[in-house]
């Protein structure tokens, strides 16, 4: 990731680099070519990050936290490149780095501000707690503190509970919303302003379906074009809620185009899948198939939840036998 700001004529150049937790980054620094190159990278003007002079690294007094995590672009030093390759950044690495570059001609000092962000893919969950229904938007690890917004039928909701747990290096956040008795559609957006990354969860409840025993049911599940990008890896899961917990009926992975089916009466139409239609059929219904069916389409950028309520009623024959 390269700098957002680079002021060429200011002697103390200050650039901003945004890194992602556990990924590698480059702290940029350039200089006018010259002989006898000396490069010293320091953190917060105190800790030695990397030293290079007389043609080789000198890491004897390198701060232990940088051991085996830093290197220069050795083949490019003679071309004026003093950038530092920095492995596996952590939130503790955030701060100001100073690059001192000296040659027989001149000495320059560059400052680089490193900011580190975390955004582990959030999830949207649908939960039943006794007689209440909840939608929960949660993110296991995020930094800095994200902006969470809820919408009901595309209208922002001001009520926004946030359960926050802060660990040493990031936040874990749950935002539950009570949707008991509602037929509205809901949307939750979690935004990491530093990483400029936004995730959206969308929940839609379909009209209840009444079916007779032994019949089949077709349940629709089509992504909303606003979020869905077929080029992006995603996963589709169909599950059924039984006594408060969901059991997975089938799932599809776009990366491998694999479909795994756990319920023999479940069927997916391959042709429809190719058209990004993940509607499913459940054959030979029985009374125990009554309940809520959840289609979950998830990628790194969104989760689309579609809920169907199915009521299976005894057929006339079954009823008359009883």
């Amino acid at each position: 990731i390269f700098p957002l700001a680079f002021f060429i004529y200011v002697p103390m150049n200050e650039q901003i680099v945004i890194g992602r937790l556990d990924e590698d980054i480059i702290l940029p620094s350039s200089f006018e070519r010259g002989s006898e190159v000396v490069i010293h990278w320091k953190y917060q003007d105190s800790y030695k990050v990397h030293s290079y002079y007389k043609g080789s690294d000198h890491l004897e007094s390198q701060d232990p936290r940088y051991a085996n995590r830093t290197s220069l672009f050795y083949n490019e030093i003679q071309n004026g490149n003093a950038s530092l390759f920095f492995r596996r950044v952590s939130l503790l690495d955030e701060g100001i780095y100073t690059c001192y570059v000296g040659t027989a001609i001149q000495v320059i000092t560059n400052k680089v501000v490193l900011k580190v962000g975390v955004f582990l893919t959030p999830v949207m969950k649908y939960e039943k707690r006794n007689t209440n229904s909840f939608l929960i938007c949660s993110v296991l690890s995020v930094y800095p503190r994200p902006i969470i917004t809820w919408k009901m039928d595309n209208t922002p909701i001001s009520e926004n509970n946030m359960e926050e747990t802060g660990s040493l290096d990031s936040f874990s956040i749950n935002s539950p919303l009570n949707i008991t008795g509602s037929n509205s559609s809901y949307e939750c957006t979690i935004e990491n302003s530093l990483l400029k990354q936004t995730w959206t969860g969308r929940w839609t409840m379909k009209d209840g379906l009444h079916k007779m025993q032994s019949e089949h049911v077709s349940l629709s599940c089509q992504p909303v074009n606003d979020y869905f990008s077929p080029n992006q890896d995603f996963k589709v899961t169909w599950s059924r809620m039984k006594s408060g917990t969901f059991s997975v009926l089938a799932y599809y992975l776009s990366s491998s185009q694999n479909t795994i089916i756990n319920e023999s009466r479940f069927s997916w139409n391959k042709e429809l899948i190719n058209q990004s239609d993940f509607s499913m059929n459940l054959m030979d219904l029985n009374l125990s198939d009554s309940g809520e069916y959840l289609c979950n389409i998830s990628s790194d950028e969104y989760t689309l939840l579609t809920i169907h309520t199915v009521h299976v009623e005894p057929s006339q024959e079954t009823a008359s036998h009883n």
Partner: antibody
Framework: QVQLVESGGGVVQPGRSLRLSCAAS????????MHWVRQVPGKGLEWVAV????????DYADSVKGRFTISRDNSKNTLYLQMNSLRVEDTAVYYC?????????????WGQGTLVTVSS | DIQMTQSPSSLSASVGDRVTITCRAS??????LAWYQQKPGKVPKLLIY???TLQSGVPSRFSGSGSGTDFTLTISSLQPEDVATYYC?????????FGPGTKVDIK
Amino acid sequence: QVQLVESGGGVVQPGRSLRLSCAASGFTFSNYGMHWVRQVPGKGLEWVAVIWYEGSEKDYADSVKGRFTISRDNSKNTLYLQMNSLRVEDTAVYYCAKDLISGIYYVDHWGQGTLVTVSS
Amino acid sequence: DIQMTQSPSSLSASVGDRVTITCRASQGISNYLAWYQQKPGKVPKLLIYAASTLQSGVPSRFSGSGSGTDFTLTISSLQPEDVATYYCQKYNAAPFTFGPGTKVDIK
């Protein structure tokens, strides 16, 4: 142009202390390593100590280790040499000198020197 | 620590002569060697660094060579203003020891 002006020399008894100063101008002092070099009148040059540009690293000649301390104040553009437990053999002209770069190279500019005489 | 020796300790030569001074390190120092000239009553002046690179403003009659342990400073045609003591200094790592010096004068 680079200017280095030493001060603080004088006559001192063995065992006593003295602090030399070097006022630097004409260059960005905080960007360069600095050395002290001494010379007994009529004899050769002896390297004494070096300090890196930001003061983080210091090195000394064996003959002064544990007795002399090099330091710098970058906000005042000044280099210092604190000399304790002085001996007769420390009598010399002390030169303040600028390193080519950060404190790991040769001297490219010298001051005029200040004479330290250790005598009882 | 690495010791630096110079030879000869002094020499006399005629104006126009080629003069060679040798500096030897007790261990290899690559090309991290500088040469200084100190005229009587003056402060030292840098002549050559990196064993063979001439400092700007220094006359081209001065040249340096060598690498590892053996180095030479050559004055191709001695001039009256070259009367001085010449010192080598290692700077591969501290301590940055000087050689004992070679005094050059005119016959």
